[in-house]
Interface confidence: low
């Protein structure tokens, strides 16, 4: 999947299986990514587990789990808030669009999470105070979690190079440039560009991600995934000057 | 936890959060709130030895005291109940705490935290 980190780096990761996105004293988020096509290096998110850890007299531990074709509007225990404690309403799940869009507010840690199902796959977005991100037991022993440190270099796909290689080549793009088996030949580059332009008029990294996804999979739902990802940034990002990321902000992963 | 630093943090936060914005940096009220905060941390010091939140609060108070030329002696403030800021960015507003400290219990030195964003989508 495409990842925008807490430090506004933009990466395309081919990580497969379960990986931690966020891990601190208050919150643990783990995603499971699966290949979009058999043998493909490109992966998308098929499962998401969010654990809100037991916190003082505010909330009980709550676990939220979403999978492909199952986007519940409740925690795994069936509740929609933080439990029986007096601050239980400082953690709430709201269903925005049934089966497609859920928002979780954890006011006790100033955090908003948006989970969507777009097509077959899930998208995730979070707005969280830096204090919460930095509230970890022991910095030295922290593992690799993606929102903070980005993907390992060997797990990244250079989709911008892919974008450059495919530009103007139509359906006859070089197979070597593709990180996945060739998507249906009926989906030429020009069509991908047109579909992405329709939803994402600014040629930023979200637009480029959209083009990459359409060429990789031939699945038009990925246009919506990029569109909603940008919409979530508009809602959740505190710096309105950083909504659109461009090629120059591309960076190597963290430690 | 026997360490009550989070209570001190939230009391300071509510004392410096009015109906519109944090108390103006240069007002006597801000210094009074800082002195209350310092007093609160001293009261809980014995049970907070080694607590990261406690030590960062103590250092933060010292920094703020010197930044704002607050004298160590002087009046202290009572924490006041926080009311939500006026209409503006709806996201800012709805993430802000309400009266219950559970609505935002982690603040240390600033009424408005620095927010950060992470997103994952597509393939």
């Amino acid at each position: 999947p495409h990842l925008r980190t807490f430090t506004d780096r933009f990466q395309t990761c081919k990580v497969q299986g379960a990986w931690p996105l966020i891990d601190n004293n208050y919150l643990n988020v783990q995603v499971t990514n699966t290949p979009v096509l058999p043998g493909s290096a490109a992966t998308a998110t098929s499962k998401l587990t969010i654990i809100f850890k037991n916190f003082q007299e505010c909330v009980d531990q709550k676990v939220y789990q979403a999978e492909m074709d199952e986007l519940p509007a409740a925690f795994v225990d069936g509740s929609k808030n933080g439990g029986d404690k007096h601050g239980a309403n400082s953690l709430k799940i709201t269903e925005k669009v049934s089966g497609q869009h859920v928002e979780i507010r954890a006011k006790y840690i100033g955090t908003t999470i948006v989970v969507r199902q777009v097509g077959r796959y899930l998208t995730f977005a979070v707005r969280v105070p830096e204090e919460v991100v930095n509230a970890v037991e022991d910095w030295d022993s922290q593992g690799l979690y993606l929102c903070l440190r980005g993907c390992p270099l060997n797990q990244q796909i250079d989709f911008q190079a892919f974008h450059t290689n495919t530009e103007g080549t139509g359906a006859r793009r070089l197979a070597a440039a593709s990180p996945a088996p060739t998507a249906p030949e009926t989906f030429p580059y020009e069509t991908a560009v047109a579909k992405c332009k329709e939803k994402l008029p600014v040629e930023d990294l979200y637009y480029q991600a959209c083009v990459f996804d359409l060429l990789t999979t031939g699945d038009v739902n990925f246009t919506l995934a990029a569109y909603y990802a940008l919409e979530d940034v508009k809602m959740l990002h505190s710096n309105k000057d950083k909504l659109h990321l461009y090629e120059r902000t591309r960076d190597l992963p963290g430690r | 936890s026997p360490c009550k630093i989070l209570k001190c943090n939230s009391e300071f936060w509510s004392a410096t959060s009015g109906s519109h914005a944090p108390a103006s940096d240069d007002t006597p009220e801000f210094c009074a709130a800082l002195r209350s905060y310092a007093l609160c941390t001293r009261r809980t010091a014995r049970t907070c030895r080694g607590d990261l939140a406690y030590h960062s609060a103590v250092h933060g108070i010292e920094d703020l005291m010197s930044q704002h030329n607050c004298s160590k002696d002087g009046p202290t403030s009572q924490p006041r109940l926080h009311t939500l800021p006026p209409a503006g960015d709806s996201q800012e507003r709805s993430d802000s705490p309400e009266i219950c400290h559970c609505e935002k219990s982690f603040h240390k030195h600033s009424a408005t935290p620095n927010y950060t964003h992470c997103g994952l989508f597509g393939d």
């Epitope: 379960a18 643990n28 499971t32 654990i51 850890k53 037991e137 022991d138 | 989070l6 990261l52």
Partner: antibody, heavy 120, light 109 residues
Framework: EVQLVQSGAEVKKPGASVKVSCKAS????????ISWVRQAPGQGLDWMGW????????NYAQKLQGRVTMTTDTSTSTAYMELSSLRSEDTAVYYC?????????????WGQGTLVTVSS | QSALTQPRSVSGSPGQSVTISCTGT?????????VSWYQQHPGKAPKLMLY???KRPSGVPDRFSGSKSGNTASLTISGLQAEDEADYYC?????????FGGGTKVTVL
């Protein structure tokens, strides 16, 4: 040297409570969580719960909810586990263990264990 | 009973390799990157041997290795030695599950 030293063996009657202590040394106590694990005679290991000395956050095994309380005293770098309404099946060796990373991920240093016998 | 299944016992001669399996569900093992293994000698406290599926803490001999395939995690001891005779437990954290396997007795013949 990182060490966890536990309190001595206890004999309790059914219905009573027991409080086991675990004193940490050789590292910053608030930088690591503490898990508690028990082992009945001849049986396997059983995870009881976890506490963060940093924040006071706890998470208890579902089956012990309501009977177990974990606390810490950061001034003495000591963790405590109290189990109430004891029954004979609570007879076990109780271990505290330092958590290496995150709340539950692995336990890298263990106490020597405290035998708690529940008998009428 | 435990939701992580281990064989009751495995045995091998000195110098041989033995593998202990730990089978769970997709949430407890398959999707978890947090599987650890513990060695326990009789009357002693457990000792961490592997964490995060494959990582070895300092001081643990490199004859101990870990892997995972599907919903099964494995601990392999290659070049078995007399002091490896002990009970071994797998442990996994994923989502709602935090649990130990039932334990495997390793006997050095």
């Amino acid at each position: 040297e990182v060490q966890l030293v536990q309190s001595g063996a206890e004999v309790k009657k059914p219905g009573a409570s027991v409080k086991v202590s675990c004193k940490a040394s050789g590292y910053t106590f608030t930088s690591h969580g503490i898990s508690w694990v028990r082992q009945a005679p001849g049986q396997g290991l059983d995870w009881m719960g976890w506490i963060s000395p940093y924040s006071g956050n706890t998470n208890y095994a579902q089956k012990l909810q309501g009977r177990v309380t974990m606390t810490t005293d950061t001034s003495t770098s000591t963790a405590y586990m109290e189990l109430s309404s004891l029954r004979s099946e609570d007879t076990a060796v109780y271990y505290c263990a330092r958590v290496g990373s995150g709340p539950y991920y692995y336990m890298d240093v263990w106490g020597q264990g405290t035998l708690v016998t529940v008998s009428s | 009973q435990s939701a992580l299944t281990q064989p009751r016992s495995v045995s091998g001669s000195p110098g041989q390799s033995v593998t202990i399996s730990c089978t769970g569900t997709s949430s407890s093992v398959g999707d978890s990157i947090y599987v650890s293994w513990y060695q326990q000698h009789p009357g002693k406290a457990p000792k961490l041997m592997l964490y995060d599926v494959t990582k070895r803490p300092s001081g643990v001999p490199d004859r101990f290795s870990g892997s995972k395939s599907g919903n099964t995690a494995s601990l392999t001891i290659s070049g078995l030695q007399a002091e490896d005779e002990a009970d071994y437990y797998c442990y996994s954290y994923a989502g709602t599950d935090t649990l130990f396997g039932g334990g495997t007795k390793v006997t050095v013949l």
